[in-house]
Amino acid sequence: DAEFRHDSGYEVHHQKLVFFAEDVGSNKGAIIGLMVGGVVIA
């Protein structure tokens, strides 16, 4: 399992994804939307 996490620390293991709070300006992922800092990075 990989990790899904909101900026605020909420996390749940969910499928084979990695999500975390990332500055969009770093161009390291895609904004998921409707959450805090949620970006797909893998």
């Epitope: 900026d7 605020s8 895609a30 904004i31 939307g33 959450m35």
Partner: antibody, heavy 121, light 111 residues
């Protein structure tokens, strides 16, 4: 301006597959995940999942039990949603959508115009 | 999965009067003082439009007559003074956990 333009209506027989496209323009394609939401006639909204144009990784609603596949083509800024083993209950309008995160200072949503998929023998 | 339940199913309100729609989640959609609860408006033949996000914040370009309140499991969308163009179906949605889920919708009509 941001636009999501979807492919046209489809009529399919039970057991077949359908592939709906969503072409994005007006922003950097890889920056936002694309979500898919469907709506059966006269019914409510159902979230199907999303795909990341950046990495190609997808997250699906497990209700669809492996019947759904979301892919992207970065060369054409297009996302695809394929649904297999179609049944009559899959008759619906399928929407693609893009959302901002809460922490962007403004939150907007953008939706495709919808694609009607009719499953009928 | 989180189940979202809206009430009422439909609502008829006079022009200029207040309309109130309720949404209940089967478990809390809050995290660290943020409610991951959104409201949409959908008019016939159109895709949904985001009205309210994070329970209380207005989406871009949304008129001030639309407001949201609540936290935890219980939320409310209020239209302070109903206008003719507000006739639509309204949906709540949680974005705390996957799969995202929507309420069944509330149809708002003019009395």
């Amino acid at each position: 301006q941001v636009q999501l333009v979807q492919s046209g209506a489809e009529v399919k027989k039970p057991g077949a597959s359908v592939k709906v496209s969503c072409k994005a323009s007006g922003y950097t394609f890889t920056t936002y995940a694309i979500h898919w939401v469907r709506q059966a006639p006269g019914q409510g909204l159902e979230w199907m999942g999303f795909t990341s144009p950046y990495s190609g990784v997808s997250n699906y609603n497990q209700k669809f039990k492996g019947r759904v596949t979301m892919t992207r083509d970065t060369s054409t800024s297009t996302v695809y949603m394929e649904l297999s083993s179609l049944r009559s209950e899959d008759t619906a309008v399928y929407y693609c959508a893009r959302f901002d995160n809460y922490d962007r200072g403004y939150v907007r949503d953008y939706w495709g115009q919808g694609t009607l998929v009719t499953v009928s023998s | 999965d989180i189940v979202m339940t809206q009430s009422p199913d439909s609502l008829a309100v006079s022009l200029g009067e207040r309309a109130t729609i309720n949404c209940r989640a089967s478990e809390s959609v809050d995290n660290d003082r943020i409610s991951f609860l959104n409201w949409y408006q959908q008019k016939p033949g159109q895709p949904p439009k985001l009205l309210i996000y994070a329970a209380t914040k207005q989406g871009t370009g949304v008129p001030d007559r639309f407001s949201g309140s609540g936290s935890g499991t219980d939320f409310t969308l209020t239209i302070s003074s109903l206008q003719a163009e507000d006739v639509a179906v309204y949906y709540c949605q949680q974005s705390k956990v996957f799969p995202w889920s929507f309420g069944g919708g509330t149809k708002v009509e003019i009395k």
